[in-house]
Interface confidence: low
């Protein structure tokens, strides 16, 4: 339904508070280096303009598209050329090319300072002095560091952030109340950002069909009692929501997400028995709850899949009549029966089924040709099962930190050209699969582990795309979305890699390491481990373990010394010499 003024329509639908928050997020995700005050000024100008359009939809410029209005506003930033370089060239383009240009310049790894958390009293004072500015600053800082963060979900995080400060700043022990809540929000936020980044990569790099296939599989697992037509409707609507958010259309995205939540709750009887509690919550909580809702129970009387998809003589006829609908039905039927499979595995099975039908429906005897198609699924199912079993055993044996180290070594040997910070970040996240998923029973391990690994490997892919250094990473990232994990798993030591020159400076440490948190200290040690492997890719596990044990002892010893800096200087030289000898550097 066309509106005379799109900006007035969205302002009325969303309300002033959400409108302003979403415009701030949109601007911060596009112009990631701009100061907070500049963004607030732009948002206020847009909001005042929107109000004039609400009062009179025929007023000047009110008929312009949101991209035109927002793009024009962004292009008024005086320092665009010196701050953003070639991004300023976007402003010479017309819509829709201008928006596409801004999207292409979003930076997954912006050169911004790490967010340092002030003292609790300082934060509480700032919160009480100006709550509105304090919360806007939160939106701004998250959005500019995570340019694909799911905007309506960020509003939910901001609501929780506000609630944490409201409660804890009047508690007897403010820090004990607030810090765990902030830690939880930070960790959940990073996870949410990474999950959304995969959705956007799926849409942008592999197209709408790939995203819809993912959504069919996931929603069919979650809502196995829903009819195929119902799942298809939800998939279409969900695809629209994520296409809008990934495309920077945050007002439309938030509005459509609210409509989808409303539809789901109005039709929960035909969707899932698990939605009741979610649907009693306010809007932001409701949408979040629906997105995280547990899988409904499978209907008890589901017939064998083989009847419709293998034994039927009409398989090729049904396939030819509407290929994507037939494949969608196959995926729906398979997924609703298999909450124990990862979404990516279900998509691999569907792809194998599609490939088989493509060749068999052109053969002389199609039925004989595709009769054994389900046999081809067995190795595809066993491969992730075996991999998860092996890695969970290793995780249980080593614990998270040492398991991360094993993955650090494994991935550095596979793709040693990748930057050390990226290898550390990605391997640490890969290693978290252990604590996250290995505690689950068998039936929940694979969907937990493999779908989580897809999210983490996408981080590697988007970071690598910014500065490509490895053909192997490019190949695994671009050839097939659903086969990324098997592709990386299949990589072995890169025999073409020329080891890095030894640089003693890389292994020189100072007393400041003693004041770091346990997590930061681990990152320092893991950074050194990656550098060691880059110098000596053929080093054995035993050699690397010996060096890392010596390193841990060295840090512990010097952090206990009276003259820490001298200890680090003198003992550090000995450690470097001993490590060189041990590894034959």
């Amino acid at each position: 339904d066309a509106h005379k003024s799109e900006v007035a329509h969205r302002f009325k639908d969303l309300g002033e508070e959400n409108f302003k928050a979403l415009v701030l997020i949109a601007f911060a995700q596009y112009l990631q280096q701009c100061p907070f005050e500049d963004h607030v000024k732009l948002v206020n100008e847009v909001t005042e303009f929107a109000k004039t359009c609400v009062a009179d939809e025929s007023a000047e410029n009110c008929d312009k598209s949101l991209h035109t209005l927002f793009g024009d506003k962004l292009c008024t930033v005086a320092t665009l050329r010196e701050t953003y370089g070639e991004m300023a060239d976007c402003c010479a383009k017309q819509e829709p090319e201008r928006n596409e240009c801004f999207l292409q310049h979003k930076d997954d790894n912006p050169n911004l300072p790490r967010l340092v958390r002030p003292e609790v009293d300082v934060m509480c004072t700032a919160f009480h002095d100006n709550e509105e500015t304090f919360l806007k600053k939160y939106l701004y800082e998250i959005a500019r560091r995570h340019p694909y963060f799911y905007a309506p979900e960020l509003l939910f995080f901001a609501k929780r952030y506000k609630a944490a400060f409201t409660e804890c700043c009047q508690a007897a022990d403010k820090a004990a109340c607030l810090l765990p809540k902030l830690d939880e929000l930070r960790d959940e936020g990073k996870a949410s950002s990474a999950k959304q980044r995969l959705k956007c990569a799926s849409l942008q790099k592999f197209g709408e069909r790939a995203f819809k296939a993912w959504a069919v599989a996931r929603l069919s697992q979650r809502f196995p009692k829903a009819e195929f037509a119902e799942v298809s409707k939800l998939v279409t609507d969900l695809t629209k929501v994520h296409t809008e958010c990934c495309h920077g259309d945050l007002l439309e995205c938030a509005d459509d997400r609210a409509d989808l939540a409303k539809y789901i709750c109005e039709n929960q009887d035909s969707i899932s028995s698990k939605l009741k509690e979610c649907c009693e919550k306010p809007l932001l909580e409701k949408s979040h709850c629906i997105a995280e809702v547990e899988n409904d129970e499978m209907p008890a009387d589901l017939p064998s899949l083989a009847a419709d998809f293998v034994e039927s003589k009409d398989v090729c006829k049904n396939y030819a009549e509407a290929k994507d609908v037939f494949l969608g039905m196959f995926l729906y039927e398979y997924a609703r029966r298999h909450p124990d499979y990862s979404v990516v595995l279900l998509l691999r099975l569907a792809k194998t089924y599609e490939t088989t039908l493509e060749k068999c429906c052109a053969a002389a005897d199609p039925h004989e040709c595709y009769a054994k198609v389900f046999d081809e699924f067995k190795p595809l199912v066993e491969e992730p099962q075996n991999l998860i079993k092996q890695n969970c055993e290793l995780f249980e044996q080593l614990g998270e930190y040492k398991f991360q180290n094993a993955l650090l070594v494994r991935y550095t040997k596979k793709v040693p050209q990748v930057s050390t910070p990226t290898l550390v970040e990605v391997s640490r996240n890969l290693g978290k699969v252990g604590s996250k998923c290995c505690k689950h029973p068998e039936a929940k391990r694979m969907p937990c582990a493999e779908d989580y690994l897809s999210v983490v490997l996408n981080q590697l892919c988007v970071l690598h795309e910014k500065t490509p250094v490895s053909d192997r990473v490019t190949k695994c990232c671009t050839e097939s979305l659903v086969n990324r994990r098997p592709c990386f798993s299949a990589l072995e030591v890169d025999e073409t890699y020329v080891p890095k020159e030894f640089n003693a400076e890389t292994f020189t440490f100072h007393a400041d390491i003693c004041t770091l948190s346990e997590k930061e200290r681990q990152i320092k040690k893991q950074t050194a481990l990656v550098e060691l492997v880059k110098h000596k890719p053929k080093a054995t596990k035993e050699q690397l373990k010996a060096v890392m044990d010596d390193f841990a002892a060295f840090v512990e010893k010097c952090c206990k010394a009276d003259d820490k800096e001298t200890c680090f200087a003198e003992e550090g030289k000995k450690l470097v010499a001993a490590s060189q000898a041990a590894l034959g550097l």
Epitope: T352, P379, L380, R472, N483, P486, A490, L491, E492, E495
Partner: nanobody, 116 residues
Amino acid sequence: QVQLVESGGGVVQPGGSLRLSCAASGFAFRGFGMSWVRQAPGKGFEWVSSINNGGSDTYYADSVKGRFTISRDNSKNTLYLQMNSLRAEDTAVYYCAIGGPGASPSGQGTQVTVSS
């Protein structure tokens, strides 16, 4: 560029044996799982067997289990298929392919005919 060249096919009597080879070049062979697929006259492609990149895990279609053995030599960038107890229904063009069971062949293939 990626090249897969199959060889070793021929005419053999039922119960006989053949060893197929696939010489790979233009990609990091040691980094990828490999498969054999076949196409009988007038039929579609049928997956035969797969092996992981290191050679430690192997998979077979039920129709060849116990008769065929897949292996690889990463130092020679070569994939093998040892075929024993051949039957008339094994007659087909055999192709090697990069990847697991769903992999698509890109080479010319090698003809295997089992006939008395």
